[in-house]
Interface confidence: low
Amino acid sequence: CRTSECCFQDPPYSDADSGSASGPRDLSCYRISSAGYECSWQYEGPTAGVSHFLRCCLSSGRCCYFATGSATRLQFSDQAGVSVLHTVTLWVESWARNRTEKSPEVTLQLYKSVKYKPPLGDIKVSKLAGQLRMEWETPDNQVGAEVQFRHRTPSSSWKLGDCGPQDDDTESCLCPLEMNVAQEFQLRRRRLGSQGSSWSKWSSPVCVPPENPPQPQVRFSVEQLGRDGRRRLTLKEQPTQLELPEGCQGPAPGVEVTYQLQLHMLSCPCKAKATRTLPLEKMPYLSGAAYNVAVISSNRFGPGPNQTWHIPADTHTEPVALNISVGTNGTTMYWPARAQSTTYCIEWQPVGQEGSLATCNLTAPQDPDPAGMATYSWSRESGAMGQEKCYHITIFASAHPKKLTLWSTVLSTYHFGGNASAAGTPHHVSVKNHSLDSVSVDWAPSLLSTCPGVLKEYVVRCRDEDSNQVSEHPVQPTETQVTLSDLRAGVAYTVQVRADTAWLRGAWSQPQRFSIKVQVSD
């Protein structure tokens, strides 16, 4: 027999045994030109001393063989004795070490068996109703294909799936999407309606992340508020390493996870921008405000579930930093100014109502006044802090108010609203004899004492009605009792108490009249 022809004789070896794990496999045959054909196959196992024979049986029942030696690819023409227009059955027999191994058979019409290409170029991946959708452009002149996919995870072997028939310029496939593990996909194609024809090679790997991006293990901590009114948010984390299937461990775009930090400043709701997203490792400086912080993990399918933490407001207060002057036209606050052209946010909230939304006002950018102070004024009609109750006031500052991470806390303090002078007047002043020349004066705490740092002192005034002589006694804001001594028996006195703030003298309580009885000796 000539080497270019299929030899219609018995092959020069004994019968084949197809039960071996090694041997020839993955035989594919197809037309490569108008009159040229090619068959190729894989050989598993040691190749030394192996001789391959491509066997062919015609529909008439006559069989022939090509001897290819150690080669696993053979080209032949339509003149080689193999019918190309009719169905033929082909297989490979490999002879080695006195035994013969046989490949699975393929039955096909060679002329119609065109070598199909796998999906080439960009395979678009998207999520559709909980499944994975892959889409690609049909290779040139190859419309009409059957498509299969295979997929594996880092811990599983390949599983085969069917994409169904395709008959368009673009082809697509719906595949399973894993929730928590990455997958590697490959696709292959063959001519539609020719069951015996050969499959294309597998496509390049398509690497698909899990539907849920892996969450990093994150712990936040926040430093003390510095003198500049800012505190550093720090993070301790361990990124979650997602194991990848074998074919995705080289350059395999598509499985990346991006982590971002989302900051939401809860305080000062009247400012321009409350939320900012920034890279996870850019640990920002924060003001003393309350924040919600979220870590967002995203992959090619979009963001996954958030992890959210609450960072409470820094409650440290400086009671002396704020001056408040109440006049007939309204109220003005003064505080040490920051740099030129600073915007301030003044926020206030009744104490005990911390759960409700605070009221706030944003100033226009202002420069320090000649005394180095910044100011904010409001009229009585505005109703701001008009009720006679304790308010928590926080002032924030920023030279760039639209940049969330550039706000700082200027001060945090308390203020008693409304007519503090009258509202703070101590009530229930009572006088009790203490000794022959002294009395004990008691009163109920001023409403101002509910407001931390606001009540500077009580003043107790005692007037001798005979001589009109007046004495005043300062009392610590934590005390509600004082002893008046060196009093004279039989003289009428009046006593009054007032409560003072740092910037305001209180109103005297109603005068309380008393006298010490003259002791009559027996």
Epitope: A182, P239, T240, L242, P251, V255, T258, Y259, P279
Partner: nanobody, 123 residues
Framework: QVQLVESGGGLVQPGGSLRLSCIAS????????MKWVRRPPGKGLEWVSV????????KYSDAVRGRFTISRDNAKNTLYLQMNSLKPEDTAVYYC????????????????RGQGTQVTVSS
């Protein structure tokens, strides 16, 4: 074409030191966060350390913190890993990896990676 070439691995006794280098080409090195990852024998990939594009943000896994130091020289397109107080459990193939952005946390998956350099810690 991204290329990452690691060197500096070898056999070292417990307690010893090694310095790994990784020369990068095919992309603007100074624009990307870089990482070291490793694959111990018979195990999956482990994250070791990461440094962002400009260098100020550096992070380490708990297993190496205090013993390993990551650094980069953007002028030389080179990433380094100084490994001190090595332990047998540090035995692995060490890979240099490029993230998909300048941010140290832009990716926990290493889409571009070198061929690796073997580090063996044994007495």
């Amino acid at each position: 074409q991204v290329q990452l070439v690691e060197s500096g691995g070898g056999l070292v006794q417990p307690g010893g030191s090694l310095r790994l280098s990784c020369i990068a080409s095919g992309f603007t090195f100074s624009d990307y966060a870089m990482k070291w990852v490793r694959r111990p024998p018979g195990k999956g990939l482990e994250w070791v350390s990461v440094i962002d594009s400009e260098g100020p943000t550096i992070k380490y896994s708990d297993a190496v913190r205090g013993r390993f130091t990551i650094s980069r020289d953007n002028a030389k397109n080179t990433l380094y890993l100084q490994m001190n107080s090595l332990k047998p459990e540090d035995t692995a193939v060490y890979y240099c990896a490029k993230s998909n952005g300048g941010s140290a946390f832009s990716s926990v998956l290493y889409t571009d990676r070198g061929q690796g350099t073997q580090v063996t810690v044994s007495s």
